[in-house]
């Protein structure tokens, strides 16, 4: 008899990452009989929702349904109809919603309620929308990259699945940069985690991990820029802010009310004699770097050592995967190569920031001015955060790997979140490897 393909015995899962600047939907797929194996879940689709983050819908919650439609419809197309009802959907909201909740639990609840109602209208198995903690965001990012790198597998392989993967089982640290927060997560070397808030204990695949994590709310790239502007405008003599973090010739008008909308600028808030001010770029990396450093309070540390703002940070250990905006920004600046030293990155940033705005616009005609204008700040901020914030050095810089995808799956917290909620990471090593599903009979 002729060989006939059996229906694929696969499962799907959907996670929406409701970030501060945008929402992305991820679809994951895995063989049903290999749920407890490490590295079998992979991403089959990413859909970026058009528009801002959900926290911006406070004044227009009725538009949330339409906002989510395209990506949810895409999920309907990608996932076979027969699988819809058993496909779990999770939405995790991060720092943008943490900030909205800080201002008002009612407004945050209202946004989430409408999101939940919208997502419940689809034929999937909706599991709820919630604001995840900064600790979860860091932990799940760490789980994601180490799962994808095969670090939890007890089988040592003779081959390497990604260029920067080492064959040893030492886990990678995770560096995540968003618009409103940044997370640092890693396993310190024989170091007591002095602050209980920063300590996590995991048992994964039969191995114990003592993990350090911290999420710096307000230190994502967008909120850091708001902080810097609020700090700098305090000492401006008039409504002109000459800003070294923007290209020479760049001009933009900012409303003071927008500047003080976020809790992140609360410490810099003051009564100004104007309602608006104009940013005028002067494009100077060194001055920009100095201005950014003023956002990191390093004068106070109640522990043996700190990152900044009195937050405990153990000595850095091992290799780190830097993803999300760490990757997007450095990729745009063409600085993700393993061969680019920290000194070279600094040199390139100096040149880039000094380029006139008109020249930059001509060089990147396809990039929207709003995003294009901020790469000088973002690149400088990344350097400042990694070097002065997290204490990487010119030598340890080579241990940072700017990662977009690993094996076709995006680095980020969403995969780790789904693996946890679907109980796909066992505490103990599975006793036997399930027989592989034979596709043909």
């Amino acid at each position: 008899t002729q060989n006939k393909a059996l229906p694929e015995n696969v499962k799907y899962g959907i996670v929406l990452d409701a970030g501060s600047s945008h929402t992305s939907l991820y679809i994951y797929k895995w063989p049903a009989e290999k749920e407890n194996d490490t590295g079998v879940v992979h991403q089959v689709e990413e859909c970026r929702v058009k528009g801002p983050g959900i926290s911006k819908f406070v004044q227009k919650v009725n538009e949330i349904g339409i906002y989510l439609t395209d990506c949810m419809e895409r999920a309907r197309e990608v996932i076979p109809r027969s699988q819809h009802q058993e496909t779990p959907v999770y939405l995790g909201a991060t720092a943008g919603m943490r900030l909205l909740r800080m201002e008002s639990e009612e407004l945050a609840d209202r946004v989430l309620d409408v999101v939940e109602r919208s997502l419940s209208n689809y034929p999937f198995d909706f599991q709820g929308a919630r604001i995840i903690t900064g600790q979860e965001e860091g932990a799940y990012g760490w789980i994601t990259i180490n799962y994808l790198l095969g670090k939890f597998s007890q089988k040592t392989r003779w081959f390497s699945i990604v260029p920067y993967e080492t064959n040893n089982q030492e886990t990678f640290g995770a560096l995540d940069l968003g618009g409103a927060s940044t997370q640092v997560t890693f396993v310190p070397q024989n170091q007591t985690i002095e602050s209980p808030d920063n300590a996590l204990q995991f048992r994964l695949y039969g191995k114990d991990y003592n993990v350090y994590t911290h999420s710096f709310l307000c230190y994502g790239k967008d909120q850091a820029l708001w902080q810097k502007l609020a700090k700098d405008i305090q000492v401006a003599s008039n409504e002109i802010l000459r800003d070294p973090c923007f290209h020479p010739g760049y001009k933009k008008v900012v409303n003071v009310s927008d500047l003080y909308k976020t809790p992140c600028t609360k410490r810099f808030e003051m009564t100004l004699p104007f309602q608006q001010f104009e940013i005028q770029g002067i494009g100077n990396y060194q001055q920009c770097h100095q201005s950014i450093l003023e956002l990191f309070n390093t004068s106070y540390c109640p522990y043996s050592q700190c990152a900044f703002n009195g937050i405990f940070l153990p000595p850095l250990q091992g290799d780190f995967g830097a993803f999300s905006a760490f990757y997007f920004v450095m990729k745009f600046l063409n600085l993700t190569s393993e061969k680019v030293s920290q000194e070279k990155v600094t040199e390139m940033m100096k040149k880039f920031c000094a380029q006139p705005w008109e020249e930059i616009k001509t060089s990147y005609p396809a990039v929207a001015a709003k995003y294009l204008s901020e790469y000088c700040f973002s690149g400088t901020y990344i350097l400042s955060l990694l070097l002065q914030g997290y204490h990487f050095t010119a030598d340890s810089w080579e241990h940072i790997h700017f990662i977009g995808k690993i094996q076709g799956s995006d680095a980020g917290w969403t995969l780790g979140y789904m693996l946890n909620l679907t109980n796909m990471i066992p505490a103990e090593q599975p006793l036997s490897t399930p027989l592989s599903h034979s596709t043909y009979v």
Epitope: Q59, V61, S104, E105, E106, T133, G134, D197
Partner: antibody, heavy 116, light 111 residues
Framework: EVQLQQSGPELVKPGASVKMSCKAS????????MHWVKQSHGRTLEWIGY????????TFNQKFKGRATLTVNTSSRTAYMELRSLTSEDSAAYYC?????????WGQGTLVTVSA | DIVLTQSPASLAVSLGQRATISCRAS??????????MYWFQQKPGQPPNLLIY???NQGSGVPARFRGSGSGTDFSLNIHPMEADDTAMYFC?????????FGGGTKLEIK
């Protein structure tokens, strides 16, 4: 479980200052604002102001501005309120409460008595 | 400042009956489709306890006999059926704008 533990009662002289504390547990301290509320004669509740533990920024009821100072120590997860130039009118129970706009969790209160 | 006028100042209700407390704001406390109105219960020697948030949502662990309603400037708290344990002071609060303000309180007793 969210808990706010306030410091004990204070007996202070007119013109002096008092500093009370509110130790938080059971949640991420920097994710929520901390408010302070005054209650006199077991009836009148007055909002004093709030602090953003994340960065130390604060907002006050104009009535208390200049006389009240709000601070935090994030490593010990503690919020503080100092009241200066005390008069008999300041004799009251002072509460800390966690929230943005919803005061869902309150400390047990610190009773301040201003007396010569 | 938004002034909250609570009435009555005191109220005595028989067990099993309905208690209604009202709170009127000097201007609307609604914003972005949310009513920033809250109701608290306070017993002697204890801090206030959140009963109702957003005008009509029950706080965590609050019995269903406590109901909040209203929008804009007029709000009410209904307790039905009245139980002995409900003897307490009740306060309304607005957090629409700074300074956040409280009503003068209603003393609820058993008749």
């Amino acid at each position: 479980e969210v808990q706010l533990q306030q410091s004990g009662p204070e007996l202070v002289k007119p013109g002096a200052s008092v500093k009370m504390s509110c130790k938080a547990s059971g949640y991420t301290f920097t994710d929520y604002n901390m408010h302070w509320v005054k209650q006199s004669h077991g009836r009148t509740l007055e909002w004093i102001g709030y602090i953003v533990p994340l960065n130390g920024g604060s907002t006050f009821n104009q009535k208390f501005k200049g006389r009240a100072t709000l601070t935090v120590n994030t490593s010990s997860r503690t919020a503080y309120m100092e009241l200066r130039s005390l008069t008999s009118e300041d004799s009251a129970a002072y509460y800390c409460a966690r929230g943005g706009t919803r005061f869902a969790y309150w400390g047990q209160g610190t009773l301040v008595t201003v007396s010569a | 400042d938004i002034v909250l006028t609570q009435s009555p100042a005191s109220l005595a209700v028989s067990l099993g009956q309905r208690a209604t407390i009202s709170c009127r704001a000097s201007e609307s406390v609604d914003n972005f489709g949310v009513s920033f109105m809250y109701w608290f219960q306070q017993k002697p020697g204890q801090p206030p306890n959140l009963l109702i948030y957003g005008a009509s949502n029950q706080g965590s662990g609050v019995p269903a006999r406590f109901r909040g309603s209203g929008s804009g400037t007029d709000f009410s708290l209904n307790i039905h059926p009245m139980e002995a344990d409900d003897t307490a002071m009740y306060f309304c609060q607005q957090t629409k704008e700074v300074p956040y303000t409280f009503g003068g309180g209603t003393k609820l007793e058993i008749k």
